[in-house]
Interface confidence: low
Amino acid sequence: NIDVCKLGTVTVQPAPVIPLGSAANISCSLNPKQGCSHYPSSNELILLKFVNDVLVENLHGKKVHDHTGHSSTFQVTNLSLGMTLFVCKLNCSNSQKKPPVPVCGVEISVGVAPEPPQNISCVQEGENGTVACSWNSGKVTYLKTNYTLQLSGPNNLTCQKQCFSDNRQNCNRLDLGINLSPDLAESRFIVRVTAINDLGNSSSLPHTFTFLDIVIPLPPWDIRINFLNASGSRGTLQWEDEGQVVLNQLRYQPLNSTSWNMVNATNAKGKYDLRDLRPFTEYEFQISSKLHLSGGSWSNWSESLRTRTPEEEPVGILDIWYMKQDIDYDRQQISLFWKSLNPSEARGKILHYQVTLQEVTKKTTLQNTTRHTSWTRVIPRTGAWTASVSAANSKGASAPTHINIVDLCGTGLLAPHQVSAKSENMDNILVTWQPPKKADSAVREYIVEWRALQPGSITKFPPHWLRIPPDNMSALISENIKPYICYEIRVHALSESQGGCSSIRGDSKHKAPVSGPHITAITEKKERLFISWTHIPFPEQRGCILHYRIYWKERDSTAQPELCEIQYRRSQNSHPISSLQPRVTYVLWMTAVTAAGESPQGNEREFCPQGKAN
C-alpha cells in the first residue's frame, strides 16, 4: 500500500501508461519543509521497483537529474508488460539506524494498443431470443481496453453495448438485448466492434448478416413416437418445433450402438415415419431443426427420447442338441437342449418353447411347453424319432427347428480321426480332427461338444456345443471354458440317419495339481500289491491329469524311490504293483501329473508284504 503522499510527490513522463519498449522518467519531489531535520543536504531520495509486490530493483544508479535534498529524476527502461509499482523513499544518511521513509509512489502500466477485432460471429437463439455477438480480440493489451459493439439495420435501427477487458476479465462477447423478428428475414444488418485503450484504438471490419444467417432455432421439444398397429419396426416420430422451421434432421440408434442412423426431413411439420426399426430394441431418438433449406444454422440436438420398440414374432432357427441314454432294454431317455435366440432373432421376451418329440413311423407325438432351454423325456428305444423346438413371445412363435434323433456314437465308421485339443490361451481350446476314414454316408455336419470333467456334470450341467460345417476340421471352443479345468470334448460326425464320435480331454490352461491322490488301502493278492486310492478333488486337479505315479521305497532307506506310472482313467482307482520284497516294510505314496508338472505327494502308507518274491 502506498501511503498518502504527505512528504512529497511522484510524477511520470511522458505518462503512467506507456507502450512496450518505451522509457519513462520518474520524478520524486519533497514538499517544502519536508525531509531530514536540520540537514536538508543529507536528504537522499531513492526509487524502488516492485513487481507483484516483490522488490526487484533499487534504481539508485538510474538517476538522470538531482536537486540535492529536494528532488530526483530517474529513468526506467525495459519495463515488462503489465503493471509495475515504483516507490520513492527518503533516506536520511546521517541516521544509519532509521529505515528509509516512503514519500510517494506511482504505478506504470506497459501495454500495447488493441488490434482490430476479428472473426465476428452473431447468433440469436430461437425466434424470441436476443442477438449476441462474439469476436476475437487479438493480442492481449495488458491494459484496460473498452470494446463497443454497434449494430445498425433497416429503418434507422441502431444499437450498441460496451464491455471492457483487464487483467481480471476478458471481453469478447456481448448480448445486444434486442430481438430480430422473422418479418426482417430479408433485411441486412451490420455490426462492428471498436476497441479503445490509453495507447490507441482500432475497429473491426463491418460484419454483415441477415436474420437467417444468425438465428439458430431452438431444439425441438416434446418428442414422442407412435408405433403403427403396435409394429416393432415401423413408428411415427412426432415433435414440436418453432413456427419457421422448414428442415429437420433425425438421428436414432439402438442404445448399445456406436453409430447413428441419419435422416433429413423437409417440411415435416413435426412428424416423420420410420420403417427400419428393430423390434424389441431400446432406441434413442434426437432431432435438430433449421429455418432455411440452404442457409442458416442447425439447432442443437433435442433432448433424447429413449423408448423400446414393441415385440414381433421370433425369427431364426434354434440351435438344438441332444443326449441319449439307455435306461433298460426297451426304454431310453432323451434330453433335448437348445441355445437361446439372440435378441435380433427373439424380437421380444421369449415366454416359452414348444417342444415336440415324434416317432416317424408310428406317428406317436409327445408335446410340451417349457420355459427352460432343455427338456427330458423317456421314450421307447424302438423306432425312428425326430424332435422339433420353436420359441414363442407375446406376438407369435418361430418356425420349428427339427433334428433327427440318432445314436450319436453308434457308427464307428463315422468316427472322426486324429482328434486333438490344444490350449490356445486362458479362455479357449483349439480342437482339430480328420474326417472319418470309411464313412458309408456323407457327413452333414460336425458337432463339437464339451463338458467339464467334474462329478455330476452330466446331470447338473447342460453340454456346450458348436455346429461345424462338413468341410471344416477345426473349432475354437471358448464358451464356459475356464483355466485349470479339464473338459471332455467330443467330436460328432452326423449323417442323415447315423452318428459317430471321438472323444478327447483338454484344458485351456494347466498347473501341477495341488495335491496327490489319497491311498485308501493296500491289499496283497497273489504276490502282488493292489494300491487303491481316491481321486484328487476336481478343483485341485488344475487341468487334465495325464497319468498317476505310484512311488515306493523301503521304510528306512535313503535311496531314491521306485515308481510306476499309470495312465489316468476316471473310472480306475486301483492298480497292482509287483517286485516288492516280502517281509520288508515299504512306504508308498502317489502323485498326479498334468502337462504342467507333478503334484505334491499324497498321503504315505506303510505296508509289509507277506508273500514270496516274484
Epitope: 495341488v514 495335491s515 478343483p539 505334491p600
Partner: nanobody, 126 residues
Framework: QVQLQESGGGLVQAGDFLRLSCVFS????????MGWFRQAPGKEREFVAA????????QYAEAVKGRFTISRDNAKSTVYLQMSSLKPEDTAVYYC???????????????????WGQGTQVTVSS
C-alpha cells in the same frame, strides 16, 4: 485383471479383536480360493489362513488356530479374517491373496498365490 483391496487394519490393544475384509474385483470370485498372509518387519511373508472357492474347506497356520477365522461371502465378492485374542506378535502387514487353485497341505508358500492386495497394517500394543 484381478484386483484385491484390503481394509479393517488398525491399532488395537492386546486381547482385542479385529475383522479384516478383502474385496475382490476383475474376475469371478467363486473361481478363486483366497488366503491371508502376513509380514512383520524384517521377516518373511508367512501364511495365516486359506479358504476354498466354495467356502467348505479352510486351513490355518498353527500360530493362529483357534483365534482367527477365515470366511467368505461369494455374493459380495469379499473374504474376511476375524481375529480375536490378538497378541503383540500378531503385529504385521496383512495381505489378501487369490488363486484359481486351492492347495491342501503344509506348504502354503506365497508363490502359490497368483494375485495379491497391497496390504493393511495391524498393530497390537501391549
Amino acid at each position: 485383471q484381478v484386483q484385491l483391496q484390503e481394509s479393517g487394519g488398525g491399532l488395537v490393544q492386546a486381547g482385542d479383536f479385529l475383522r479384516l475384509s478383502c474385496v475382490f474385483s476383475g474376475g469371478t470370485f467363486g473361481d478363486y480360493s483366497m488366503g491371508w498372509f502376513r509380514q512383520a518387519p524384517g521377516k518373511e511373508r508367512e501364511f495365516v489362513a486359506a479358504i476354498r472357492w466354495s467356502g467348505d474347506s479352510t486351513q490355518y497356520a498353527e500360530a493362529v488356530k483357534g483365534r482367527f477365522t477365515i470366511s467368505r461371502d461369494n455374493a459380495k465378492s469379499t473374504v474376511y479374517l476375524q481375529m480375536s485374542s490378538l497378541k503383540p506378535e500378531d503385529t504385521a502387514v496383512y495381505y489378501c491373496a487369490a488363486d484359481p487353485s486351492y492347495y491342501i497341505g503344509p506348504n502354503h508358500t506365497p508363490s502359490r498365490y497368483r494375485d495379491w492386495g497391497q496390504g493393511t497394517q495391524v498393530t497390537v500394543s501391549s
